[in-house]
Interface confidence: medium
């Protein structure tokens, strides 16, 4: 699927408000950069079910961001 070879936001639209915790394999946070001027929270789902964007303003996203920042700093 040769699509989207360029630097830009990865999330199309605001994103889902929540993802079932049991379905989450991994959460990645993309901070604002030259490629994209907003924070993006990308959830990788278990069982090769792809990825979803989580709305960074949602309660779940804020908790994930907090958790990741605590871990990293």
């Amino acid at each position: 699927f040769p699509m989207f070879k360029r630097g830009r936001c990865l999330c199309i639209g605001p994103g889902v408000k929540a993802v079932k915790v049991a379905d989450i394999e991994k959460a990645s946070i993309m901070y604002p950069s030259n490629n994209c001027d907003k924070i993006e929270v990308i959830i990788t789902l278990k069982e090769n079910k792809g990825q979803r964007c989580l709305n960074p303003k949602s309660k779940q996203a804020r908790l994930i961001i907090k958790k990741v920042e605590r871990k990293n700093f």
Epitope: F1, C11, R52
Partner: nanobody, 129 residues
């Protein structure tokens, strides 16, 4: 009731143009990525283009880049696909779909097709040589 209604398909000669429309109702347009897919006979459904209604960002498959343009009219809750320089290989049924949380990765199918929230019934586009 949620509805996505496509229109604008038809028969056109190679090199010609068409404009597809997708009228959405029954959900909050701005919360969704609005995408066009197509399915040719005997082939898998493939992503063509997406637009974020909230900020206007647009995304295209390599096969249509420079020829197709996606746009939306938020006041009318309608998404358009302007198709120029059409080729016989563009012949397919074109579907409009809406999903939340679409990631523009290697393809528009990062979100599995069955997880797209809403689908239209499709409109046939036939390009003759």
């Amino acid at each position: 009731e949620v509805q996505l209604v496509e229109s604008g398909g038809g028969l056109v000669q190679a090199g010609g143009s068409l404009r597809l429309s997708c009228a959405a109702s029954g959900f909050t347009f701005d919360d969704y990525a609005m995408c066009w897919f197509r399915q040719a006979p005997g082939k898998e459904r493939e992503g063509v283009s997406c637009i974020s209604s909230s900020d206007g960002s647009t995304y295209y498959a390599d096969s249509v880049k420079g020829r197709f343009t996606i746009s939306s009219d938020n006041a009318k809750n309608t998404v358009y696909l302007h198709m120029n320089s059409l080729k016989p290989e563009d012949t397919a049924v074109y579907y409009c779909a809406a999903a939340q949380g679409v990631v523009a990765g290697a393809s528009l199918v990062w979100v599995p097709l069955d997880e797209y929230d809403y689908w239209g019934q499709g409109t046939q586009v036939t390009v003759s040589s």
